[in-house]
């Protein structure tokens, strides 16, 4: 397909030719072309590409251009043929490749397909049966990352309420641009009735810890120092608690934002790998005070900021007073 | 008690570098991130980026990228903020503050003021 | 990029009323994040609220920040002398333009 520019052009190169588009992995889609026949000897050829809503654009000397992009709507590149790098100067007439997602009704295609990175470790997807779909529809999740040589197929599919889902492991590499990558992901069923669904969930979102566990609460003064397990596989730049303490005869609920705390006093268990401490200050010891902590990753880490881990569970120390 | 101690004022000419200095007491240095601020003349605050000294990641604003340094050497507790080349609009009252993981500057530097002027 | 938009840009108040104080979110931001200084004339910042409604360290809780989503508020419930000043909300690496809170 040709695009061709309604202004009036000075002298142009001619357009590109052979230009195809294929899928790799599951979201990759990558465009090939090879240079225009008899363009200008003195000319050293550049490419000018967008993609069809003009947008993304791009002025290399490659004879190709990929994108990592869910495959649920058509996309299109045009390019064009130039002998600069100047985005002013008219590329070539435009030369359009457009790629469709797989057939199917769309109605049929499941849809909230959003996932969610666990701890570091393991990533689970969830996904609504779309509304054309029989009941009994067996669905299989395929995801593929950086890391892995080919496409896999999610294994421990499971139902909550009216969600279907899917867990895979997927473990943080010491490689330092690891995170750097998107994990693609494909539902279909294993019938081939429904319309696939894709998704790309970068490594940088969608990222929830585990709960911290709590060792140890004891009183000093009138301080409550609160010590606590810090959930693996996390730096301490990318994590924060917020430490919940509840006062059955005040009724008073307070919370403190903390960082990665080292136990440095007498009163806690010292040096002990991956734990971390705080002080609650001008609390009764003669009352019952219950805490609770909860972690979230740091925006500078990881881009999804509204993802909090469960809170830990409940441990409390003092006395509850009889009410007279 | 947290203190954050910037270098002294400076008075430069365009094209010349710079580099001035945050230190940090009172708190472990190396568990806090430090950020840079900028604020020119009569205007408001603008983040230039920020600086974690456990392992000296660091993240810059997208205006500021490329424009500026940001470093720190965590034996003596001190962040560093420099120029390669000045212009006359890096005129402007820099400070450094400390961040924790939520992102708020709980304690500032006193401020320096570069002056960039042939 | 989110972009933080402060009103009013001035507020001309007298010493005893209320102050109320708009910061808005161009998309919707995580209230663990958003933070609330006052500057006075030849000073630093101050950090006054944090994670939108918790008070920082010595400051009077005639201050108070609320809000979350795209919609956050600082509120003086009865200004004193000294809380005359500019006021500014921040997410990371972003910062809205500033209030100034003046003598009426």
């Known amino acids: 397909d040709y695009k061709d520019d309604d202004e009036s052009r000075t002298e142009t190169q001619p357009p590109v030719t052979n230009l195809s588009v294929s899928v790799e992995n599951l979201c990759t889609v990558i465009w090939t072309w090879n240079p225009p026949e008899g363009a200008s000897s003195n000319c050293s050829l550049w490419y000018f590409s967008h993609f069809g809503d003009k947008q993304d654009k791009k002025i290399a000397p490659e004879t190709r251009r990929s994108i990592e992009v869910p495959l649920n709507e058509r996309i299109c590149l045009q390019v064009g043929s130039q002998c600069s790098t100047n985005e002013s100067e008219k590329p070539s007439i435009l030369v359009e490749k457009c790629i469709s997602p797989p057939e199917g009704d769309p109605e049929s295609a499941v849809t909230e397909l959003q996932c969610i990175w666990h701890n570091l470790s393991y990533m689970k997807c969830s996904w609504l049966p779309g509304r054309n779909t029989s009941p009994d529809t067996n669905y299989t999740l395929y995801y593929w990352h950086r890391s892995l040589e080919k496409i896999h197929q999610c294994e421990n599919i499971f139902r909550e309420g009216q969600y279907f889902g899917c867990s895979f492991d997927l473990t943080k590499v010491k490689d330092s641009s690891f995170e750097q990558h998107s994990v693609q992901i494909m539902v279909k069923d294993n019938a081939g009735k429904i319309k696939p669904s894709f998704n790309i969930v970068p490594l940088t979102s969608r990222v929830k810890p585990d709960p911290p566990h709590i060792k140890n609460l004891s009183f000093h003064n009138d301080d409550l120092y609160v010590q606590w397990e810090n959930p693996q596989n996390f730096i301490s730049r990318c994590l924060f608690y917020e430490v919940e303490v509840n006062n059955s005869q005040t009724e008073t609920h307070n919370v403190f934002y903390v960082q990665e705390a080292k136990c440095e006093n007498p009163e806690f268990e010292r040096n002990v790998e991956n734990t971390s401490c705080f002080m609650v200050p001008g609390v009764l010891p003669d009352t019952l005070n219950t805490v609770r902590i909860r972690v979230k990753t740091n925006k500078l880490c990881y881009e999804d900021d509204k993802l909090w881990s469960n809170w830990s569970q409940e441990m409390s120390i003092g006395k509850k007073r009889n009410s007279t | 008690e947290v203190q954050l101690v910037q270098s002294g004022a400076e008075v430069k000419k365009p094209g010349e570098s710079l580099k001035i200095s945050c230190k940090g007491s009172?708190?472990?240095?190396?568990?806090?991130?430090i950020g840079w601020v900028r604020q020119m003349p009569g205007k408001g605050l603008e983040w230039m980026g920020v600086i974690y000294p456990g392992d000296s990641y660091t993240r810059y604003s997208p205006s500021f990228q490329g424009q500026v340094t940001i470093s720190a050497d965590k034996s003596i507790s001190t962040a560093y903020l420099q120029w390669s080349s000045l212009k006359a609009s890096d005129t402007a009252m820099y400070y450094c503050a400390r961040m924790p993981n939520w992102g708020s500057l709980d304690h500032w530097g006193q401020g320096t003021l570069v002056t960039v002027s042939s | 990029e989110i972009v933080l938009t402060q009103s009013p840009g001035t507020l001309s108040l007298s010493p005893g009323e209320r102050a109320t104080l708009s910061c808005r979110a161009s998309?919707?931001?995580?209230?663990?994040?958003l933070a609330w200084y006052q500057q006075k004339p030849g000073q630093a910042p101050r950090l006054l609220i944090y994670g939108a409604s918790s008070r920082a360290t010595g400051i009077p809780d005639r201050f108070s920040g609320s809000g979350s989503g795209t919609d956050f508020t600082l509120t003086i419930s009865r200004l004193e002398p000294e809380d005359f000043a500019v006021y500014y909300c921040?997410?990371?690496?972003?910062f809205g333009q500033g209030t100034k809170v003046e003598i009426k």
């Open positions: 998309q919707s931001i995580s209230s663990s994040y």
């Open positions: 009172g708190y472990s240095f190396t568990s806090y991130w």
């Open positions: 921040q997410q990371y690496e972003t």
